[in-house]
């Protein structure tokens, strides 16, 4: 029987009455066009909803937008369009919400053709009031907040000017012209690329990378011959054109661009690309595209300096620059990532790593599941997960995989069981141990979300027909109850819950269609009365993450330490609550060779954990050097994996070698590092 259908499933008592008392409908008094929703702040209950409606007329498009505000997690909405003078808001810029609990909101308005500049509406009180401000430029991008100070904003203009405001958009100053891309770094630093001759496109590969640490008073050129740049964790990356040909290479800096090192990664040609898949303060996952239009490349993982890279996964699916990749950070368990590979026969298979890219394996076949038509052997197959690529291919996959840091171990995803991803209608699978084991959670495609740090999972069937039923589970997806939230079914468009999965409210969005009109409608359901008591100590049990073999002394050790968590028992129906903090206890493991990566000039032979000196350096290894000039590279062949906390045990000591190489990069010559003032 399907999950939740057997009679022994744990029932939640009187849930219909409890939910009926906590279901709130709001019908929006405007025509169905598009709707966008933003949460303002954390645990504030404030939601802004912007509805827009376009009527194409003969010469132009007539547009109308309305702004609504809720301060009770979506149970009630108030039309506040008059606060923005009934102005039409440009949806492509969305609602720029300030970082953390700043309460700041910027809306970008549509202005008539001949105006000198754009117009914004600013709020710094969680959208209770707005101030209209006319801009001295037409914005090309959404306003970007400095992560450190929400009063500092930057934006690019349609004429490629870089504009900065120091007073939350009240006054703007153009600090540089001919800017292609700008990003906030740490400590209110701005990094940006500039062109000298024609345009961003024409000068691609000849751009300069600049930095200002004082909001435009002074500048420093920190790179030339730049193709693009990116920030990830504490690393600043730039792809730089080679002198001799049209290839480019990655250079990395960990001091905001003062000094650079060439990364030990293959160079790429014009049609190829690099992509930072994930980064933290310890390391980076880098995708390097394969030559030709293959749709795949190689994942490399970095050392702690971002310089030395180990090959992590071949044939990694990544369609084009800015295209689709299924690479997913499983945020509910440290070290876990899921992605897809394109196999030789062009089928797509899911791979998972539990140790931050050290080893990749197939996902274990869910218990009590049968292999589908893609499987050669009906008894041996794997689970394959649908993610961004499947969604882009318009498969029947309404949602990407879901995990939340405070819902430890839980991963929910659409998938199929076979030798490869299937185009058949997928089912929804859940893992409660961070991806080691899986079970079918729901039959057919669904929308799903996690509430109360995993205490409740909510799902809605993906259907082309109108719906009026929501499903929920209080035991991590084992048993499901269904609740009819309205008599009149609606055309469902989305589930919305407060980011962070701490809320107990869920909003179901959709529209009703009648003979002449269709209207937006939302239903907000509060589950607080289902979880009627606060969880106590007895409601939690102890769980060891990454456990695979209790008889192994180092069971659970990943990156040099193991972690035990207090997790809610599946049978406990109680509230974790908004202030819930994951309780975990780490313990350090003994070091083994697995805790070390091979440093530059060394490699691991197949099925060996020892690092062996490379007999000769070829290709990109030969070009690699430190700080862009001839350098003594001293190594004993091993380097601790970034973030690894092991102590004692194996300490791989090999003879220290000096690896001298002729540097091939003149990416940065000292004369280029001149400071400029505005």
């Amino acid at each position: 029987s399907a999950p939740g259908e057997d009679e022994e499933c744990g029932r939640v008592r009187d849930f219909v009455a409890k939910l009926a008392n906590n279901t709130h409908q709001h019908v929006f008094d405007d025509l169905r066009g598009s709707v966008s929703l933003s949460w303002v702040g954390d645990s504030t209950g404030v939601i802004l909803v912007l509805t827009t409606f376009h009527v194409p007329l003969v010469i132009m498009t007539f547009g109308q937008s309305k702004l609504y505000r809720s301060e009770d997690y979506g149970k009630n909405f108030k039309d506040i369009t008059d606060l923005i003078n009934n102005t039409f808001i440009r949806t492509e810029f969305g609602m720029a919400i300030g970082p953390e609990n700043s309460g700041k909101v910027v809306l970008t308005a549509e202005v008539s053709g001949g105006s000198r500049g754009g117009r914004i509406f600013r709020s710094s009180d969680f959208a209770k009031n707005f101030v209209q401000t006319d801009l001295p430029f037409h914005p090309l991008t959404q306003m970007m907040y400095s992560p450190q100070n929400s009063d500092y904003l930057l934006a690019l203009s349609t004429e490629n000017g870089l504009w900065v405001s120091k007073n939350f958009g009240g006054k703007w100053e153009e600090i540089h012209k001919a800017v292609c891309l700008a990003k906030w770094g740490s400590d209110n630093t701005i990094f940006f690329t500039t062109y000298a001759n024609g345009s961003c496109k024409a000068d691609l590969g000849a751009l300069e990378l600049w930095r200002t640490s004082d909001l435009g008073k002074s500048f420093k050129t920190i790179g030339v011959k730049i193709y693009s740049f990116g920030l990830g964790g504490r690393f600043l990356f730039a792809s730089v054109m080679a002198d001799k040909d049209t290839t480019r290479r990655i250079h990395v800096s960990t001091d905001q661009g003062d000094t650079w090192s060439m990364a030990q990664l293959p160079s790429v040609g014009q049609e190829q690309f690099y992509s930072i898949l994930a980064a933290n303060d310890d390391m980076v996952f880098m995708h390097v595209d394969e030559p030709g239009d293959t749709g795949f490349g190689t994942i490399f993982t970095s050392d702690d300096r971002g310089i030395v890279y180990s090959k992590s996964l071949d044939r990694h699916l990544y369609t084009t620059t800015g295209g689709e990749t299924d690479f997913t950070n499983v945020t509910s368990l440290r070290g876990v990532y899921i992605t897809s590979v394109l196999s030789e026969d062009n089928s797509i298979q899911t791979m998972i790593t539990f140790d931050q890219g050290g080893r990749w394996t197939h996902l274990r076949k869910p218990e009590n599941s049968e292999c589908d038509a893609t499987a050669k052997n009906k008894n041996e197959c794997s689970l394959h997960i649908h993610a961004s690529y499947s969604i882009s291919q318009k498969l029947n996959v309404p949602m990407a995989p879901l995990s939340e840091p405070n819902a430890v171990g839980i991963v929910i995803a659409h998938g199929s069981v076979g030798d490869a991803i299937s185009v058949m209608v997928p089912d929804v699978y859940i893992s409660d141990d961070g991806g080691y084991s899986w079970t079918k959670m729901l039959e057919g495609p669904h929308y799903y979300t996690i509430l109360d740090s995993g205490g409740i999972i909510v799902a809605i069937e993906h259907s082309s027909r109108p719906i009026n039923v929501i499903k929920f589970s209080t035991d991590e997806g084992q048993c499901w109850q269904t609740y009819t939230f309205t008599r009149d079914p609606i055309y469902f468009t989305g589930l919305a819950s407060e980011p962070g999965a701490r809320s107990m409210n869920i909003s179901i969005w959709g529209f009703t269609e009648s003979f002449l009109t269709s209207q937006w409608v939302s239903y907000t359901i509060d589950f607080k009365d289902i979880l009627e008591r606060n969880c106590e100590e007895k409601d939690y049990t102890i769980w060891l993450a990454h456990s695979t073999d209790p008889e192994d002394y180092e069971d659970g050790c990943i990156l040099g330490y193991k972690e035990q968590f207090l997790r809610l028992r599946k049978s406990s129906v109680c509230q974790n609550g908004r202030d819930y903090v994951v309780t975990k206890q780490p313990s350090i493991c003994l070091c083994s060779l697995e805790d070390f990566l091979c440093d530059f000039g060394a490699y691991r032979p197949e099925n060996d954990s020892k690092c062996v000196e490379q007999p000769e350096l070829k290709g990109h290894d030969l070009e690699f050097c430190l700080y862009g000039r001839e350098e003594h590279l001293t190594t004993n062949g091993y380097r601790k994996i970034p973030g690894d906390k092991c102590q004692g045990g194996v300490n791989p000591v090999r003879e220290v070698k000096d690896l001298k190489k002729k540097c091939t990069s003149n990416f940065l010559s000292p004369e280029k590092q001149n400071s400029k003032s505005n």
């Epitope: 022994e8 744990g10 084991s437 049990t541 102890i542 990454h546 008889e551 069971d555 659970g556």
Partner: antibody, heavy 124, light 106 residues
């Protein structure tokens, strides 16, 4: 093969404390929870609490909260159960048992290895 | 805490009989139930874990079933060595045992 060997029988006065030890051999002691279960004469089994040696995470049945302390010494692969404020109804055989484990959950798979039991008699 | 109710408390049977013992939990415990056999003066012995998984070394005449709140231990053909007391134990809340079922010779 894993074995749990418990300390010998004890006779105690009401109001005093008793500390029973349980030494493991032949397995990875640190990776399994050790539970303490008691059985009064002619009665059923009663769980008192348990401990995970790695990290020393202990939890107790509500009935014994505040009166029982369970500890573990990883270096000697030994678990201890101390029961204070003894009364005559604490007269029982006290067992330590290893919680079997197939996944990361410590207490979910039953107790697969048991000690031989320690008889504690509380009498004035 | 979760209460476990075992029935019957005593059961008289003969060698070769099919014996069924039931255990009811006061709330759903999914499949987190174990069954033990105990003989006088001895420590209990694990027979079944996770409601239906047979512990290694236990004869296949023992089987367990159920999930949620209702569970059953079945001995398909009672052997002389099987006369003992049987306990169920839930593991999803703080551990609790059933009151026990004594299987005696008819």
């Amino acid at each position: 093969q894993v074995q749990l060997v418990q300390s010998g029988a004890e006779v105690k006065k009401p109001g005093s404390s008793v500390k029973v030890s349980c030494k493991a051999s032949g397995g990875t002691f640190r990776n399994y929870a050790i539970s303490w279960v008691r059985q009064a004469p002619g009665q059923g089994l009663e769980w008192m609490g348990g401990i995970i040696p790695i990290g020393g995470w202990a939890n107790y049945a509500q009935k014994f909260q505040g009166r029982v302390t369970i500890t573990a010494d990883e270096s000697t692969s030994t678990a201890y159960m101390e029961l204070s404020s003894l009364r005559s109804e604490d007269t029982a055989v006290y067992y330590c048992a290893r919680q079997g484990r197939k996944t990361g959950y410590y207490y979910y798979y039953g107790m697969d290895v048991w000690g031989q039991g320690t008889t504690v008699t509380v009498s004035s | 805490d979760i209460q476990m109710t075992q029935s019957p408390s005593t059961l008289s049977a003969s060698v070769g009989d099919r014996v069924t013992i039931t255990c009811r939990a006061s709330q759903s415990i999914s499949s987190w139930l174990a069954w033990y056999q105990q003989k006088p003066g001895k420590a209990p012995k694990l027979l079944i874990y996770k409601a239906s998984s047979l512990e290694s070394g236990v004869p296949s005449r023992f089987s367990g079933s159920g999930s949620g709140t209702e569970f059953t231990l079945t001995i398909s053909s009672l052997q002389p060595d099987d006369f003992a007391t049987y306990y169920c134990q839930q593991a999803d809340g703080h551990i609790t045992f059933g009151g026990g079922t004594k299987v005696e010779i008819k």
